[in-house]
């Protein structure tokens, strides 16, 4: 005869496990009993249950209401018995002894796993902006036993590093991922993917990007200097720029105060019929949290009259 | 208290064949093998075979494979070993027997048959 | 089948003396077993796995040996040891018996 059993069992924290022990021996033999004990290395073997083929399951205090026999039908060659409820601190070696007549008795052991699956973590940097160097996007970390893989996923190009420390049932993974700021990686998720044998299926934690930056502003309206004549209706400015946050606008005139009449709406600077007050040099200022931008425009209203058109400046400063 | 009671002692011709009982008590009938072993006079023992009542599951040494048929009658509690096509060689003391564990390992026997085979 | 060899078949031996008997197996086995048989009464399991005591049995019996061969011993021969003891093994089918070794006292 010869017992079977796993080299390996492995349980979840929390689950249940079932540690095997079944003899396969001739069938005129008889089992008396199964000793289950503990024997961890250097440690002396810590009793945890006698199944007996008369009286049944005896547990031994130290275990008392976790250990049970696997529920009926049950064959008497079998000696597994279930573990209640699986903690860190019963991962180790067991031994299950056989006590079997005519054949004798019969030992085996057995190493039990117990996983604990990660809770990981996801912290972002510092805030990022157009214009830093290599910079912390965002770390995650993730303990576990055994020691979990923290991977990420993202569309957009960076670098990662990882560290490891270990406890002493368990080991905490941080990898940070690293990147280059720049205004096209907003919005972009970043995603931290984190691998376990305890884990049906990978946890994954999702991080937009926010990427602060501010473009150069620009002004539209006096592409055809011509439409820029007295009398006319409707004649407008219009800055241009994009940001994160988005930006906001505000109007001057660099010679003087706004003409009567103009009207700024956000970005937009509206004008009643054109005068010839209403020439001068416009000032677009565009501001967000990470920075500021000017961008200037020379109006010169023509007059019908005048029969030499003049020229219009266009300069954006910053 | 387990007890193993045999029939009663069998004077059989050459030739015929004899069916011995084996009632059992005080246990739970189902639970144990039922050991069947041979002594002739004055000589050593020899393991015929076994059955398990539970399923009716039997197991025989090579040698009584032609000679003993091994049965169970639940209703009774009684195992059976039939010999058969007798010859004087096959005069002996039959014994049933199970394993049992208590504290440690112990056989509980039938008082054993005697079977003799003479013209 | 795995035959058992018993030796001596028949030995005696005074109170108080040591006495040892050997089974010599055909083919390896795992354990042992020894069983007593006084006159025409059922045998009795005497020692099993090797080295363990039956319930009952006295401490002076004792039991050891390994792969092909084993060995009983009495320590202090005593009167109500005198029997015939027979090995016994079951790591293989068919299970089988030693002849047997007949105890007598001088």
């Known amino acids: 005869g010869e017992l079977e059993t796993s080299d390996v069992v492995t349980v979840v924290l929390g689950q249940d496990a079932k540690l095997p022990c079944f003899y396969r021996g001739d069938s005129g033999e008889q089992v008396g009993q199964v000793a289950w004990a503990r024997v961890d290395a250097g440690e002396g073997a810590q009793e945890l249950a006698l199944l007996h083929s008369k009286y049944g399951l005896h547990v031994s205090p130290a275990y008392e209401g976790r250990v049970e026999q696997p529920p009926p039908p049950r064959n008497p060659l079998d000696g597994s018995v279930l573990l209640r409820n699986a903690v860190q601190a019963d991962e180790g070696e067991y031994e299950c002894r056989v006590s079997t007549f005519p054949a004798g008795s019969f030992q085996a052991r057995l190493r039990l796993r117990v996983l604990v699956p990660p809770l990981p973590s996801l912290n972002p940097g510092p805030a990022l902006e157009e214009g830093q160097g290599l910079t912390l996007a965002a770390s995650c970390t993730a303990e576990g036993s055994p020691a979990p893989s923290v991977t990420w996923d993202t569309e957009v190009k960076g670098t990662t590093s990882s560290r490891s420390f270990k406890h002493s049932r368990s080991a905490a993974v941080t990898s940070e991922f690293h990147l280059v700021p720049s205004r096209s990686m907003n919005g972009q998720p970043l995603t931290c993917v984190v691998s376990h044998p305890g884990l049906l299926q990978d946890q994954r934690i999702t991080h937009i990007l926010h990427v602060s930056f501010l473009a150069e502003a620009s002004v539209r309206g006096l592409e055809d200097q011509n439409l820029w004549h007295i009398g006319r209706e409707g004649a407008m400015l219009k800055c241009l720029s994009e940001g994160q946050p988005p930006p906001s606008y505000n109007w001057t005139r660099l010679d003087g105060p706004l003409p009567s009449g103009v009207r700024v709406d956000g970005d937009t600077l509206g004008f009643p019929p054109l005068t010839t007050e209403h020439s001068g040099i416009y000032v677009c200022h565009v501001s967000n949290e990470f920075s500021s931008r000017d961008s200037q425009v020379t109006v010169d209203v023509l007059d019908p009259q005048e029969d030499s058109g003049k020229q219009v400046d266009l300069v954006s400063a910053s | 208290e387990v007890q193993l009671q045999q029939s009663g002692p069998e004077l059989v011709k050459p030739g015929a064949s004899v069916k011995i009982a084996c009632r059992a008590s005080g246990y739970t009938f189902t639970a144990y093998n039922i050991h069947w072993v041979s002594q002739r006079h004055g000589k050593s023992l020899e393991w015929i075979g076994y059955i398990y009542p539970n399923n009716g599951g039997s197991g025989y040494n090579q040698k009584f494979m032609n000679k003993a048929t091994l049965t169970v009658d639940h209703s009774s509690n009684t195992a059976y070993m039939e010999l058969r096509s007798l010859t004087s060689e096959d005069s002996a003391v039959y014994y049933c027997?199970?394993?049992?564990?208590?504290?440690?390992?112990?056989?509980?026997w039938g008082q054993g048959t005697l079977v003799t085979v003479s013209a | 089948e795995n035959v058992l060899t018993q030796s001596p078949e028949i030995m005696s031996a005074s109170p108080g003396e040591e006495v040892t008997m050997t089974c010599s197996a055909s083919s390896s086995v795992s354990y042992m077993h020894w069983f007593q048989q006084k006159s025409t009464i059922s045998p009795k399991l005497w020692i099993y796995d090797t080295s363990k005591l039956a319930s009952g049995v006295p401490g002076r019996f004792s039991g050891s040996g390994s792969g092909k061969s084993y060995s009983l011993t009495i320590r202090n021969m005593e009167a109500e040891d005198v029997a015939t003891y027979y090995c016994f093994q079951g790591s293989g089918s068919p299970y089988t018996f030693g002849g047997g070794t007949k105890l007598e006292i001088k």
């Open positions: 027997a199970i394993f049992d564990y208590d504290e440690a390992w112990f056989i509980y």
